[in-house]
């Protein structure tokens, strides 16, 4: 078990096209050891995108997020500004990954889990799908995360999430703006750990959400430019290890796929996905109710299934 703090575990081959800052909640710089410098942007659906730090829109977005984070702290809100070893905030299963990003989780000896992150509005906004999570999951910024709808028609349903060792990234979350759940639209990458949730000031106004309904696959989604065409990857089978190509997803507008490849190491699970405590408490699902992430194949090229052992990774769909 090694703790490679300086090892490059997020590499970017392609950069995303523009994303409105209104759909972003965090950014992170990749490690110097990665060679090619990149900014990892997290959208409000907890997807990660590689962006070119030299582009003006990226600079503006970072500046905007910094200001939002500063305003939040001034107003007594909480936000994450982590330094040093940072655990990824979202799971591959919870959202697509930018194919230009490679996340390299390292075994650290701990058995904390990669968490399914509710891809709130933005996820849906982007593609209209998201993993289904229990209501009221508390995110790492101490705000309540609303339940999310099921996947769209045609997407793989009932896909359970599995536990993997935490990804230790030496990168720093430079800024963390208040979470604004909502759809979004580009190609991404993801990390583990509880996502920050919706704008605290909005909590009182959330609607009661009856049972999630199924959504139509391509609704709500538009094309921003030439981008790539969706390549559905319904097959979740993959070799036991190795980078997981996270597919350029239906965000055709976001330029040539900037979704991530994730190397994940399934560990034995005791049947119940564990949850790490978060800022305002922790949440543990009932053992008899595995978390189901239901997603649109277009949206998520990488779907990880919870498995009791490594071999089962290719069996359980």
């Amino acid at each position: 078990q090694h703790h490679g703090v300086t090892k490059c575990n997020i590499t970017c081959s392609k950069m995303t096209s523009k994303i409105p800052v209104a759909l972003l909640i965090h950014y992170q710089q990749n490690q110097a050891s990665c060679g090619k410098r990149a900014i990892i942007l997290e959208t409000r659906q907890h997807r990660l995108f590689c962006a070119d730090p030299k582009e003006q829109w990226v600079k503006d977005a970072m500046q905007h997020l910094d200001r939002q984070a500063a305003a939040l702290t001034r107003n007594g809100g909480t936000f994450e500004k982590q330094i040093g070893e940072v655990k990824p905030r979202t799971t591959p299963a919870a959202g697509g990954m930018d194919e230009s990003v490679v996340l390299e989780p390292e075994a650290t000896g701990e058995s904390s889990s990669l968490e399914p992150t509710p891809s709130s509005q933005e996820a849906q906004r982007a593609l209209g799908t998201s993993p289904e999570l229990p209501t009221g999951v508390t995110g790492s910024s101490g705000t309540r995360l609303p339940p999310t709808p099921k996947a769209q028609d045609g997407g793989p349903v009932g896909t359970e999430l599995f536990r993997v060792p935490p990804v230790s990234t030496a990168a720093t979350w430079q800024s963390s703006a208040p979470h604004q759940p909502g759809p979004s639209l580009w190609a991404e990458a993801k990390t583990s750990e509880a996502p920050s949730t919706q704008d605290p000031s909005t909590q009182a106004s959330t609607a009661s959400s009856p049972a999630p309904e199924e959504n139509a696959p391509s609704e709500g989604q538009r094309v921003w430019g030439q981008g790539q065409s969706p390549r559905p990857e319904n097959s979740l089978e993959r070799e036991e290890m190795g980078p997981v190509p996270a597919h350029t997803d239906a965000f055709q507008d976001w330029g040539p796929g900037s979704m991530a490849h994730v190397s994940v190491v399934p560990v034995s699970s005791e049947g119940t996905p564990s949850r790490e405590p978060v800022a305002s408490g922790s949440w543990t699902p009932k053992a008899e109710e595995p978390i189901h992430a239901t997603m649109d194949p277009q949206r998520l090229g990488v779907l990880i299934t919870p498995v009791p052992d490594a071999q089962a990774a290719t069996r359980r769909q």
Partner: antibody, heavy 119, light 107 residues
Framework: QVQLVQSGAEVKKPGASVKVSCKAS????????IHWVRQAPGQGLEWIGW????????KFNERFKGRTTLTADKSTSTAYMELSSLRSEDTAVYFC????????????WGQGTTVTVSS | DIQMTQSPSSLSASVGDRVTITCRAS??????LAWYQQKPGKAPKLLIY???TLADGVPSRFSGSGSGTQYTLTISSLQPEDFATYFC?????????FGGGTKVEIK
């Protein structure tokens, strides 16, 4: 076809509350945002906030935080906007609009609900 | 907040004229701009989003261009049904803001 049908005109006294409804049809309600925008007489457009019916989470324009409640009922595909502590300057036409998932622009609009605040 | 300034606030034109409306943002909105048309007593109608993408069913005589803080809506050949008020809207950052509107009247 996509339609957003809003509730009828309202006349309210200052300090009261108003709740406007917006019934969606012709698309999957939970796949899009519902935004609320208002237009005072002879004036421009002002964004109030959005709600994502898929999970019920809202986002507000700071100017409206605190006295605006946005909700959505998935069973009836209806979104609601409630504005409290009404004042005369809240007299306006209130529109709901559908927002696609790739950006917060508004591709379909309700017909508008006139809210008059007068003592 | 990003302020959107539209000019002119009104203009008179004839059928067949080429009409140009400008929208200036107080900050860089990176092409995340939409244009709407509104007729009296009606709701606005989306014409263009992402600075130049035509919305469904919008005639090709409408076009958008621009970058940074300066954007333009052009109607290449004004038609009788185009007499209306036009608004721009930025969706780069919240709160989303609109221009004050440009009323296109018959000369």
């Amino acid at each position: 076809q996509v339609q957003l049908v809003q509730s009828g005109a309202e006349v309210k006294k200052p300090g009261a509350s108003v709740k406007v409804s917006c019934k969606a049809s012709g698309y999957t309600f939970t796949n899009y945002y519902i935004h609320w925008v208002r237009q005072a007489p002879g004036q421009g457009l002002e964004w109030i906030g959005w709600i994502y019916p898929g999970d019920g989470s809202p986002k507000f324009n700071e100017r409206f935080k605190g006295r605006t409640t946005l909700t959505a009922d998935k069973s009836t595909s209806t979104a609601y906007m409630e504005l409290s502590s009404l004042r005369s300057e809240d007299t306006a036409v209130y529109f709901c609009a559908r927002g696609p998932t790739d950006g917060d622009y508004f591709d379909y609009w309700g017909q508008g609900t006139t809210v008059t605040v007068s003592s | 907040d990003i302020q959107m300034t539209q000019s002119p606030s009104s203009l008179s034109a004839s059928v067949g004229d080429r009409v140009t409306i400008t929208c200036r943002a107080s900050g860089n909105i990176h092409n995340f701009l939409a244009w709407y048309q509104q007729k009296p007593g009606k709701a606005p109608k989306l014409l263009i989003y992402n600075e130049k993408t035509l919305a469904d069913g919008v005639p090709s005589r409408f076009s958008g261009s621009g970058s940074g803080t300066q954007y333009t809506l052009t109607i290449s050949s004004l038609q009788p049904e185009d007499f209306a008020t036009y608004f721009c809207q930025q969706f780069w950052s919240t709160p989303y803001t609109f221009g004050g509107g440009t009323k296109v009247e018959i000369k």
